[in-house]
Amino acid sequence: HTAAQDNCTCPTNKMTVCSPDGPGGRCQCRALGSGVAVDCSTLTSKCLLLKARMSAPKNARTLVRPNEHALVDNDGLYDPDCDPEGRFKARQCNQTSVCWCVNSVGVRRTDKGDLSLRCDELVRTHHILIDLRHRPTASAFNHSDLDAELRRLFRERYRLHPKFVAAVHYEQPTIQIELRQNTSQKAAGDVDIGDAAYYFERDVKGESLFQGRGGLDLRVRGEPLQVERTLIYYLDEIPPKFSMKRLT
C-alpha cells in the first residue's frame, strides 16, 4: 500500500497528487513538481519536497558550539535537481548556469562556479544540530521530561529511531537537538536525519507537511512548548570547501 486506501491521500506528504492507478487499483501518490511516486508510509525526501514547494503557487555551558565546518542554510529556497531515488544531485545549477555542490540535505558546501564545476560525490550530512529558542514560560522545563518528549516526537511523528537522536541539551530558553547518522548506521528503510530535521523545521514554522494530521502540538507535562526561532547547523562527513574570500 503506497497511500491511505480509503480516500486515497498521502498522510506523510500533502504536496502530492494521489489516484487509484497503482497495481491492482491501489492508491498511488506522486510528488508535485517531479511526478515521482512516493512512499506514504514514511517521510518524503527533502529534495522532492523542495521541488514540490517551488512548483506550488507562491503564497560553562552545556549547549553545543557548532564547529568551524558547520553549515547553515543561508541560500534559501531553490528548485533542486533530484536523482531517481529523490536524493539531491551533488551538483546543483540555476537557470543562469551558476553551479555549486551540495550535501545530502541540499545545503551548498562550495563556492558557486560555472557549468565546468565538478562535484564528484554527494557528501553525507551525518550530524545535525537543531537550535531552538522557546517562548517564555513560568518556569524552566524539566530537562529529562523535555528530552523524553522530544525523542518520542522524533520517533512517532518523524519516524526517526531514537538511536539517531544523539542528545538533547537545554539551557532555558535554548534547546538543542543533536541528530547523528553515519552512512554505516543507516539501514534500508531508516528515515534520513536530514528529512526528519526538515519536517520538524516546517512543523515549527506552522507549515506542517502532513496530510490530515494536526499541526505540531508539543507539550511537556501538559505545558505547551512554543518555539520562537530555529537555527539548524549541518555537519558533513567531509568538511566543506569554501575559498578564504567567503570566510572573511
Epitope: H1, P11, S41, S144, D147, A148, R151, R152, R155, E156, Y158, R159, L160, H161, P162, K163, V165, A167, V168, A187, G189, D190, V191
Partner: antibody, heavy 118, light 109 residues
C-alpha cells in the same frame, strides 16, 4: 539473539521486586526494550518502555509512579515494581523493538512469573 | 488509543477461514501488528505495518486495514493455528493504558 527475564518470585502484598532482562547476541543501544505482562488466563498488558539510546522511559498511565525501567549495564534492563498487590500477579515479559521507528516487538523473552500473595 | 478486538473467541474446522477484527480509537496510520501466542510461550510477531508478513510466517495469514479498522484473516486453518491472537498499535506510547487488543482465542476443530 535472545532476551531472558529473571527475578520472578512469590512476594507479600506491599512488597517491592526488581526483574532483570538480559540481552544476548545484539547491541542493546540500537533498540528499545518494552515490558509487557500477562495475568493468568488474561491478555497482554503493556507496562512501559525504555529508549536505550538516551535512556528515556515511558509508562502506561496505570503504571506511572509504581514501576520504573532502567538500563543497568550494556546488556541488562531492569523493571522495579513497588507496592505490589494481588492484581500484579502475572508473567512479565521483556521484548525488543525491531530496530525501526515503530514499536513492533520481534524478539521476546520467555517470561518470569511474579506471584503476589499472603 | 484504545484497541478493541473482536470476537473474544472463534471456533472453525480445519481448512476453514477465520477473520479477527481490531479497531483503534484513533487513526494509527497502519502502524499495527498482529501476534500469535500459544500456552506457556511468549507472543510471536506475525504481521507488522498492518499487512506485511514477518519472515517465516505462512501466506495463509493476511492482514488488512487502514485508519482505525484492521483485520487478520487466517485461511486454510491448520491445527497448529490454534492459539490466541493479539493486535497491537505500534504508533504511540504516549498517554495510553494499553497498546494491545484484548485477544482472540482461535479454536481449530
Amino acid at each position: 539473539q535472545s532476551l531472558e527475564e529473571s527475578g520472578g518470585d512469590l512476594v507479600q502484598p506491599g512488597a517491592s521486586l526488581t526483574l532483570t532482562c538480559k540481552a544476548s547476541g545484539f547491541d542493546l543501544n540500537n533498540y528499545s526494550i518494552l515490558w509487557v505482562r500477562q495475568a493468568p488466563g488474561k491478555g497482554l498488558e503493556w507496562i512501559g518502555c525504555i529508549y536505550i539510546s538516551g535512556g528515556s522511559t515511558y509508562y502506561a498511565n496505570w503504571a506511572k509512579g509504581r514501576f520504573a525501567i532502567s538500563k543497568t549495564s550494556s546488556t541488562t534492563v531492569t523493571l522495579q515494581m513497588t507496592s505490589l498487590t494481588a492484581a500484579d500477579t502475572a508473567t512479565y515479559f521483556c521484548a525488543r523493538d525491531d530496530g525501526t521507528a515503530s514499536y513492533y516487538l520481534n524478539l521476546w523473552g520467555p517470561g518470569t512469573l511474579v506471584t503476589v500473595s499472603s | 488509543y484504545d484497541m478493541t478486538q473482536t470476537p473474544a473467541s472463534v471456533s472453525e474446522p480445519v481448512g476453514g477461514t477465520v477473520t479477527i477484527k481490531c479497531q483503534a480509537s484513533e487513526d494509527i496510520y497502519k502502524l499495527l501488528a498482529w501476534y500469535q501466542q500459544k500456552p506457556g510461550q511468549p507472543p510471536k510477531l506475525l504481521i507488522y505495518a498492518a499487512s506485511d508478513l514477518e519472515s517465516g510466517v505462512p501466506s495463509r495469514f493476511k492482514g488488512r486495514g487502514s485508519g482505525t479498522d484492521y483485520t487478520l484473516t487466517i485461511s486454510d486453518l491448520e491445527c497448529a493455528d490454534a492459539a490466541t491472537y493479539y493486535c497491537q498499535q505500534a504508533y504511540t506510547i504516549g498517554n495510553i493504558d494499553n497498546s494491545f487488543g484484548g485477544g482472540t482465542e482461535v479454536v481449530v476443530k
